[in-house]
């Protein structure tokens, strides 16, 4: 899709397995033409997406795309859940697909699960 609308490139039903205690950056790739839009992150609570006000965020600029980054320093167990980024553009609200973080509370480095093990956890919601 080539247009001058703002595009938020988070894949539908994207998922990440991450470890409590580690740093993690959740990226919202943003394509825009002229003025960079105002972008925010929110966390889903049922059908409501609660805006994340007091969290560290930053921009990373690349040639064809910019990234609005939500920083987890470190990841905490209650960071588990689904997130969405939104952009305000010409008084329109553009919402991304949600992306889900599956946080494992690791007791020791030797117990770190593989991505495949993460995918099998029965507590992971579809």
């Amino acid at each position: 899709k080539e247009s001058c609308d703002v595009q938020l490139y988070i894949k539908r039903q994207s998922e990440h397995s991450i470890l409590a205690g580690d740093p993690f950056e959740l990226e919202c790739p943003v394509k825009y033409c002229a003025n960079r839009p105002h972008v925010t992150w929110c966390k889903l609570n049922g059908t409501t997406c609660v805006k994340l006000e007091d969290r560290q965020t930053s921009w990373k600029e690349e040639k064809n795309i910019s990234f609005f980054i939500l920083h987890f320093e470190p990841v905490l167990p209650n960071d588990n859940g689904s997130y969405r980024c939104s952009a305000n553009f010409q008084s329109n609200l553009i919402e991304s697909h949600s992306t889900t973080l599956y946080v494992t509370d690791v007791k020791s480095a030797s117990e770190r699960p593989s991505k495949d093990e993460m995918a099998s956890r029965p507590w992971l919601l579809y």
């Epitope: 998922e15 495949d116 993460m118």
Partner: antibody
Framework: QVQLVQSGAEVKKPGSSVKVSCKAS????????MYWVRQAPGQGLEWIGR????????RYAQKFQGRATITADESTSTAYMELSSLRSEDTAVYYC????????????WGQGTLVTVSS | DVVMTQSPLSLPVTLGQPASISCRSS???????????LNWLQQRPGQSPRRLIY???KRDSGVPDRFSGSGSGTDFTLKISRVEAEDLGVYYC?????????FGQGTKLEIK
């Protein structure tokens, strides 16, 4: 245009493993999901699982959990599906497919790989 | 898992005549984003499946306009306005809303 080329037919013994490859062209696989489906002779389609090549996160149907492993190599635009502890019922054509992760604007299937499990 | 049920399983048709295949899901395929991820595949004899229809009613590029999809929630239909010889094969509905993805049993379109 998007194309997928799979590895060739395999004959395997019960209890062994098979690894099928699927090379994509015409697309940056980071922007896609790649998935695997099998079709036993004369039967319907059965979803095995999928991978997000951007971060390596794989998800499986319960039936294949622990026996199938799906991986992807972004540098070669190739996905792999390994199935272990093979039994005769695993004899099937294994298809890989790829679809656009953002808009689902394309969905392309490979030519299929026949895996025969026989003693 | 979502169960996808197709009917009929065999559909004898006369060339040039219309054909219709039904697909029902055991739960709603309406996703939280307001879209319904219901696809139709065609598998010609000896070939790989190919997607014909996605998001219930959107035709893939290169798919003739004699193919159309409709429906919502749990009830979906694939229609072929005038069957041609190249349409013969097996048609599958499948859902991309919930994990694991699941397929219908397939409907074999054959010459009467």
């Amino acid at each position: 245009q998007v194309q997928l080329v799979q590895s060739g037919a395999e004959v395997k013994k019960p209890g062994s493993s098979v690894k099928v490859s699927c090379k994509a062209s015409g697309v940056n696989i980071k922007d896609t999901y790649m998935y695997w489906v099998r079709q036993a002779p004369g039967q319907g389609l059965e979803w095995i699982g999928r991978i997000d090549p951007a971060n390596g996160y794989a998800r499986y149907a319960q039936k294949f959990q622990g026996r199938a492993t799906i991986t992807a190599d972004e540098s070669t635009s190739t996905a792999y599906m390994e199935l272990s502890s093979l039994r005769s019922e695993d004899t099937a054509v294994y298809y890989c497919a790829v679809y656009d992760g953002y808009y689902e604007s394309f969905d392309v299937w490979g030519q299929g790989t026949l895996v025969t499990v026989s003693s | 898992d979502v169960v996808m049920t197709q009917s009929p399983l065999s559909l004898p048709v006369t060339l040039g005549q219309p054909a219709s295949i039904s697909c029902r899901s055991s739960q709603s395929l309406l996703d939280s984003d307001g879209k319904t991820y219901l696809n139709w595949l065609q598998q010609r004899p000896g070939q790989s499946p190919r997607r014909l229809i996605y998001l219930v009613s959107k035709r893939d590029s290169g798919v003739p306009d004699r193919f159309s999809g409709s429906g919502s929630g749990t009830d979906f239909t694939l229609k072929i306005s005038r069957v041609e010889a190249e349409d013969l094969g097996v048609y599958y509905c499948w859902q991309g809303t919930l994990f694991p993805r699941t397929f219908g049993q397939g409907t074999k379109l054959e010459i009467k």
